[in-house]
Structures are given as C-alpha cells and as structure tokens.
Amino acid sequence: APTSSSTKKTQLQLEHLLLDLQMILNGINNYKNPKLTRMLTFKFYMPKKATELKHLQCLEEELKPLEEVLNLAQSKNFHLRPRDLISNINVIVLELKGSETTFMCEYADETATIVEFLNRWITFCQSIISTLT
C-alpha cells in the first residue's frame, strides 16, 4: 500500500511534470515563427485511456517526436533546449509509471496537434494530482 511519503513524492513528481508540460505549451502559444505552422501539422498519438500512472507509457513513447517537433522552434521561448527539457520529462515519467510492469499502450484512432496533445497530458496530471490531495 502506498505510504504518505510515497504519495507525496508522486504528487511532487506530477506537479513537476505538469509545470514542464505547461511551460512547453506556453512557449508554443507565445511563439511567432514560420516553423509554427509546420509544428502544428504534426499529428501526435493520443492514449485511448489515461486514468492511471501506467498510462504514462503512452506519453513516454511520444516524447521523441515531441522533442523533434520542438527542435523546429530553435527559439528562446524555452528555458532549456528541447533535448534537456524532454530528458527531464522522461526521467519523471519513468519514475512515475515504474519499470516493473510492461504496459502496452493503446492509442485512440484520432491523432492530435501538439497543442491538443499537451493539453491532454496536462489534464491527466491535474486529474491524478486531484485524487492524491
């Protein structure tokens, strides 16, 4: 059973992940560049279901394309290079979802823009955090 300390750790990690995702979204929304149009054409895969920490597998698998799409920006809108930012997110995701069980992600039929994708995972973080508090 999860202890109060492990729950607190999970909550802090989720809050960190939430902030990172919000930072990326803000960076995109404040971004004025010819490459933005190109960035918005990329279609990301969305989870069929995202209600538990194990479903973060679906986010993990899309982190590489997310990094490559963010790389197009070559902007100062992000405090970190996309590579470092995504690396940080990856570490948090791996810790949150755990590596003991191998969960096969199921994707929804509809794909999403980078904005819709980020909003979906921001909502996921907020939802899980609310159940922990």
Epitope: K35, R38, T41, F42, K43, Y45, E61, P65, Q74, C105
Partner: antibody, heavy 118, light 107 residues
Framework: QVQLVQSGAEVKKPGASVKVSCKAS????????INWVRQATGQGLEWMGW????????GYVQKFQGRVTMTRNTSISTAYMELSSLRSEDTAVYYC???????????WGQGTLVTVSS | DIQMTQSPSSLSASVGDRVTITCRAS??????LGWYQQKPGKAPKRLIY???SLQSGVPSRFSGSGSGTEFTLTISSLQPEDFATYYC?????????FGQGTKVEIK
C-alpha cells in the same frame, strides 16, 4: 531504445526471389511507416517504397512496381520486403528505415546484402 | 519525379576546414529535406531534418539551411570522424529521391 534488426545476407540466382525482414523494437511498430532503401556497391542511395504497418498500405517506386512486395506481421513487429525476378543489377545492400509524417528515415536497420549471381 | 542534384560530388578538405555541400531540387520542395551521413559499411545516419533542424545527438558544427530549391549543409570545423559521404533527401512527394552523394575526403 529504438532498433531495426534485419535478416542476414542472401545469395540468389537470377530469376529467383528474395525476402528480407526487418524486426522493430523500442517503439510502437504501427505508429511509424517502414521504408526500404537500397544501395548497390559504390553507388548512392535509392528509395524503393514505403509500407504502413497499421493499415498495410504500400507505395512503390515505379521501377520496382510488379516486382516488389512490402508486407508486415504486426504481432511480431516485423516488416518484409520481397523482390522477385532478380537480376544482377539487384545486387545491393537493402536497408529498412522508419518514418512518420515529416520525421523521415530517423532510424535505420543495419542493412542486408543481397547478391544475385549465377 | 523530383531530381536532387548535389555538388560537389567529392571534395578534399583538412581537419578544421569549413565545408559546404549544396543540394538543388528540380522544383520547390519547401523545407521537406533531410541530410544524411554514411560511413563505409554502415547504415546512413540522419544529421538534419526539415532543412535546418539538427538531429538530437549530432554535433552543433553541422548545420543546414535553405528552402524552396537551394539547400546547404555546412560543417563549420571538419573533424576526423566527419570524413564520409553525405546525401540529401527530398520527401515532399513520392517517390522520395536522394542526391547522388558528396564524398568528403582527407586532403
């Protein structure tokens, strides 16, 4: 980590067929197209076509149309490229590489040497 | 089909040199172009995608520029491990086509 592992070298006689496999790991196989590129010894790269592992849809370069077939087995995350009516000019290293929209050919297999000789 | 013409087909350079390779498309391909490096006996490796975005893990001495029909790959300061053959690839429309390659050799 993402890996594309291809089958071993093949020696075939003219007129025969060859089937090269490409096993994907480290990502969701159905999320990326598989492309096939070949390279004759000392020559440049030649794109042969693509296959969508999710739908099975394919697109082939006209010069290979009727001779090439790209298929997949999603249960084992493996793509195949079969080339028939082989001739000596088909002697080359055949590579598989994945792509997704405009993120193209980011990971490659190690290559499979196909030698066509009588 | 879109033709991709690379120049030069080969060049000799020394370590530390600035090297520029050009790729010209037979029609407008916007920025749907990638650059690949290949060493003997190895699979190609992507360096640049969408004309100017550096592949993660690729040294910053590599850069890409251009759009439309004229594209450039620049190596700002050639290193011993950069001696290889470089290819451009257009992927705006099928069939995708590669340039004929540029072999970078040691002077």
């Amino acid at each position: 980590q993402v890996q594309l592992v291809q089958s071993g070298a093949e020696v075939k006689k003219p007129g025969a067929s060859v089937k090269v496999s490409c096993k994907a790991s480290g990502y969701t196989f159905t999320n990326y197209d598989i492309n096939w590129v070949r390279q004759a010894t000392g020559q440049g790269l030649e794109w042969m076509g693509w296959m969508n592992p999710n739908s099975g849809n394919t697109g082939y370069v006209q010069k290979f149309q009727g001779r090439v077939t790209m298929t997949r087995n999603t249960s084992i995350s493996t793509a195949y490229m079969e080339l028939s009516s082989l001739r000596s000019e088909d002697t080359a290293v055949y590579y598989c590489a994945r792509s997704r929209q405009w993120l193209v050919l980011d990971y490659w297999g190690q290559g499979t040497l196909v030698t066509v000789s009588s | 089909d879109i033709q991709m013409t690379q120049s030069p087909s080969s060049l000799s350079a020394s370590v530390g040199d600035r090297v520029t390779i050009t790729c010209r498309a037979s029609q407008d391909i916007r920025d749907d172009l990638g650059w690949y490096q290949q060493k003997p006996g190895k699979a190609p490796k992507r360096l640049i995608y969408v004309a100017s975005s550096l592949q993660s893990g690729v040294p910053s001495r590599f850069s890409g520029s251009g759009s439309g029909t004229e594209f450039t790959l620049t190596i700002s300061s050639l290193q011993p491990e950069d001696f290889a053959t470089y290819y451009c690839l257009q992927h705006i429309s099928y069939p995708w086509t590669f340039g004929q390659g540029t072999k970078v050799e040691i002077k």
